[in-house]
Interface confidence: low
């Protein structure tokens, strides 16, 4: 003896990403000899057992059995969503309910409000926008591996009444680590199951040059050719440098190249050298002391030649 | 985790010599400057000295040319800061300083890295 509920169809509630397919599965014990039906949130008949009652070839039959009716829809657009019915004509008629939720895609995000000529300490403030989600996206910001504390996001309905556009804006100081950093804006949206969508924008940031001075050799010895490299660093890159000895009142101006060369050091050599590294964001000075170590040991006479 | 450890202070006559030592750990960081700052009593933090990855190049705050010198030992991760005819005037809370890269600055917004301090007290 089966009870009435043997006849009472069954399905689920389906989630789908616009552009993407949905499968409507539903499911009978008892089929009391009748067919069961798909109709849409407009109450139009899709299928009736395995006949296409609707012309759109984007709804097609998966399974038509006496106990199972599965169709698919492709290409899911947002007006597809709401509640589709599966009906049985038995006596009385019985229906089952799928909710299906189609997701908006949130497009890629667009960073604006970025000024070159961004000097060390100065303040930046970038926005970014990204529209077409549902439900709405949510946007955050990172600088490298760091993550930056934007606004919270704000949220717009589109014209369309369904989707959403998202925006975020991000202000921080700017320091010379940041010089050639990308800033990258990144949607967080469940229908992007967990690709990475983001946009990045590269700043560069103008600071005052720093400068280190690099013997070569490390070690140098008397007799020895010796380089002293001036290392200037900076944005703008530093363009001139001079060179002096410390010690003589004016100290004594050698050259304006960014090495300084012994072509053969004397012990007067010694002493402390001065290079200064300018560019049009300002100078800096590096100091390095000289001392020129004694000669190598000379081999004896009786290895020098073979 | 990154610590750098100061040690050295005390407390010196005027005239008198210290040498304060700067222990790194947590990372290597034989491949990047490392820097000494100061902080006396009601003022702010400021520049005395940096050496580079090499210890081949030195830059001194014009209060310490001639009178400090800054070293290094890579084999032991430390930086030392030897002062000599110390002054009143360089009483302070001493700091070592590390950036995160291998980029030289010499002003305290390029560190990323500090000791907790040392104190140098110099009183007669």
């Known amino acids: 003896n089966l009870s009435q509920d043997d006849s009472q169809p069954w399905t689920s509630d389906e989630t789908v990403v616009a552009g993407g397919t949905v499968v409507l599965k539903c499911q009978v014990k008892d089929h009391e000899d009748s067919s069961l039906q798909w109709s849409n949130p407009a109450q139009q008949t899709l299928y009736f057992g395995e006949k296409r009652a609707l012309r759109d070839n984007r709804i097609q039959l998966v399974t038509s059995t006496p106990h199972e009716l599965s169709i698919s829809i492709s290409n899911v657009a947002l007006a597809d969503e709401g509640e589709y019915t599966c009906s049985i004509f038995t006596m009385p008629v019985r229906t089952a309910k799928s909710l299906v939720t189609v997701l908006g895609i949130p497009q890629k995000p667009i960073i604006t409000g970025y000024k070159s000529s961004l000097r060390e300490k100065d303040t930046a403030t970038l926005n970014c926008q990204s529209s077409g989600s549902k439900p709405a996206a949510r946007l955050t910001w990172r600088k490298g591996d760091q993550e930056l504390h934007g606004e919270p996001t704000r949220i717009q309905e589109d014209p369309n009444g369904k989707t959403f556009t998202v925006s975020s804006s991000v202000t921080f100081q700017v320091t010379r680590e940041d010089d050639g950093a990308s800033i990258v804006c990144s949607v967080n949206h469940e229908s992007l199951k967990g690709a990475d969508r983001s946009t990045s924008q590269r700043i560069e940031v103008l600071y005052t040059p720093t400068a280190m001075i690099r013997p070569d050799p490390p070690h140098p010895r008397e007799g020895q050719k010796l380089l002293l490299h001036c290392e200037g660093r900076g944005n703008p890159v530093p363009q001139q440098y001079l060179w002096e000895k410390e010690g003589s009142v004016p100290p004594l101006k050698m050259t304006q190249e960014s090495a300084l060369i012994f072509p053969f050091l004397n012990k007067s050599d010694s002493g402390t050298y001065g290079c200064t590294a300018t560019s049009n964001m300002g100078s800096y000075k590096a100091y390095y002391t000289l001392n020129v170590n004694d000669p190598s040991p000379v081999p004896s006479s009786s290895s020098t030649y073979h | 985790q990154v610590q750098l450890v100061e040690s050295g202070g005390g407390l010196v006559q005027p005239g008198g010599s210290l040498r304060l030592s700067c222990a790194a750990s947590?990372?290597?960081?034989?491949?990047?400057?490392r820097g000494w700052f100061r902080q006396a009593p009601g003022k702010g933090r400021e520049f005395v000295a940096a050496?580079?990855?090499?210890?081949?190049?030195?830059n001194y705050a014009d209060s310490a040319k001639g009178r400090f010198t800054i070293s290094r030992d890579n084999s032991k991760n430390t930086v030392y800061l030897q002062m000599n005819s110390l002054r009143a005037e360089d009483t302070a809370v001493y700091y070592c300083?590390?950036?995160?890269?291998?980029?030289?600055?010499?002003?305290?917004?390029?560190?990323?890295?500090w000791g907790q301090g040392t104190l140098v007290t110099v009183s007669s």
């Open positions: 050496i580079d990855y090499s210890g081949g190049s030195t």
């Open positions: 947590g990372r290597t960081f034989s491949n990047y400057a």
């Open positions: 300083a590390a950036p995160a890269s291998r980029r030289p600055s010499w002003d305290a917004d390029g560190y990323d890295y």
